[in-house]
């Protein structure tokens, strides 16, 4: 057992098996589920951590309000289906043949379908709204203290770009984080915001998907910041395609 | 543990060259990293380009450097730097430094090699 | 993305103090190191976080600020002290822009 084997680990993605085993006996670590090879120095992709996670062991407001066409993510866990760079293929089925089509973000942006069903292109999500709602506290947080925090914690633990959080809303107890990120805007090596927002959203359920890291410990100037509950929208770059029946459902 | 780079030396104008930077006492195959930096005659630091060396091989590079430089790291105890296009302006020192948290955005280097000097002229 | 690092020269007796500032152009939390660098020789990590000492360092190296401001203090001047001092972030690494500070080279009288 040796000293590379030691340092041979994933700090972005336990849920990762790793092995001196790359070109010219460099670290590479491997995603459950997939096998596929993954970048530690960033966050994994929300597909890959989707797969991996069914692979493993079962255990005057200020406030915005989410757009006609704000999707949230209903179906909850799915297996599945990537693409070679581990990004969500755009058509995902069951094995029962139920076919769909998902945004980047893996959330279902049309009704179900078979194996006819045709998904022409992943469509961005563009625009996320994490709503959080915190415990109560001996008084508001201060907001600029609490904006700076929360783009403090997205840059340094999700490694996203600060340009990318477009805002932070509050109206104690509702917080709200905005994440925008454009096509054109998204760099090579640029975090997605839809995979910082999975593993703010893991963060928060107190299911880190960081290496042997603890939980997190979110404070505004010392202030423990607990969250009781937690919504995402995702608003993608073309409408969802969903029926009448639905929407009035 | 320490750093040591190579590959220094004279270059004509417009030519290219490889430096190496080799650790010894600790393997490279970890969860950080590595970067170049460089230093002119009687100037300040700046900083080249980065590669993690863990899983993955992320890069970065200082606007000035993309194109001309590549930084890659083929094993488990080297990482290279490769310029083209070489100027006088390129005359420098080149340091090779480790960083030491495996979060690119939150760095330090706290093991640096002792530099090899690079002189562009005809 | 800027770094700017005042003065770019001061001089001092021995058992002086020596105050350096560090200006960046956005929030970089506390993520801020400061180097010392003697000619002939790579620099050499002094603090990190903005405040924390590395091993080996002296007290007499004190770091301080958040944000955008940070200050290097040396207490206590000794003529080992005579070097250059360098700021350093890379919060902004992924904009292609040099983290260093333009340097301030420490006299000691």
């Known amino acids: 057992h040796t000293a590379a084997q030691d340092n041979c680990t994933c700090p972005t993605n336990k849920m990762t098996v790793c092995s001196p085993d790359g070109p010219g006996g460099r670290c590479q670590c491997r995603a459950l589920g997939s096998g596929m090879a993954v970048d530690c120095s960033t966050l994994t992709s929300k597909c890959l951590l989707l797969k991996a996670r069914m692979s493993a062991p079962k255990n005057a407001r200020t406030l915005v309000r989410p757009s006609e066409h704000a999707l949230v993510d209903n179906d909850g866990l799915y297996d599945p289906d990537c693409d070679p760079e581990g990004r969500f293929k755009a058509r995902q089925c069951n094995q029962t043949s139920v076919c769909w089509c998902v945004n980047s973000v893996g959330v279902r942006r049309t009704d179900k379908g078979d194996l006819s069903l045709r998904c022409d292109e992943l469509v961005r999500t563009h625009h996320i709204l994490i709503d959080l709602r915190h415990r109560p506290t001996a008084g508001a947080f201060n907001h600029s203290d609490l904006d700076a925090e929360l783009r403090r914690l997205f840059r340094e633990r999700y490694r996203l770009h600060p340009k990318f959080v477009a805002a932070v809303h509050y109206e104690q107890p509702t917080i709200q984080i905005e994440l925008r990120q454009n096509t054109s805007q998204k760099a090579a090596g640029d975090v997605d915001i839809g995979d910082a927002a999975y593993y703010f959203e893991r963060d928060i359920k107190g299911e880190s998907l960081f290496q042997g890291r603890g939980g997190l410990d979110l404070r505004v100037r010392g202030e423990p910041l607990q969250v009781e509950r937690t919504l995402i929208y995702y608003l993608d770059e073309i409408p969802p395609k969903f029926s009448m029946k639905r929407l009035t459902a | 543990q320490q750093l040591e780079e190579s590959g220094g030396g004279l270059v004509k104008p417009e030519g290219s060259l490889t430096l190496t930077c080799k650790g010894s006492?600790?393997?490279?195959?970890?969860?950080?990293w590595m970067w170049w930096v460089r230093q002119a005659p009687g100037k300040g630091l700046e900083w080249i380009a980065s590669i993690y060396v863990g899983s993955g091989s992320s890069t970065y590079y200082a606007s000035w450097a993309k194109g001309r430089f590549t930084i890659s790291s083929t094993s488990s105890t080297a990482v290279t730097l490769q310029a083209t296009s070489l100027t006088a302006a390129d005359t420098a020192t080149y340091f090779c430094?480790?960083?030491?948290?495996?979060?690119?955005?939150?760095?330090?280097?706290?093991?640096w090699g002792p530099g090899t000097l690079v002189t562009v002229s005809s | 993305f800027e770094m700017t690092q005042t003065p770019s020269s001061v001089s001092e007796p021995v058992g002086g103090t020596v105050t350096i500032k560090c200006q960046a152009s956005e929030d970089i939390s506390s993520n801020l190191g400061w180097y010392q660098q003697k000619p002939g020789q790579p620099p050499k990590l002094l603090i990190y976080g903005a405040s924390t000492l590395a091993s080996g360092v002296p007290s007499r190296f004190k770091g301080s600020g958040s944000g955008t401001e940070f200050t290097l203090t040396i207490s206590d001047l000794e003529a080992a002290d005579a070097a250059t001092y360098y700021c350093?972030?890379?919060?902004?690494?992924?904009?292609?822009?040099?983290?260093f500070g333009g340097g301030t080279e420490v006299v000691v009288k």
């Open positions: 350093q972030t890379s919060y902004y690494i992924d904009d292609g822009v040099n983290g």
């Open positions: 006492g600790f393997d490279f195959s970890g969860t950080y």
């Open positions: 430094a480790r960083g030491a948290t495996n979060n690119v955005f939150m760095n330090y280097f706290n093991l």
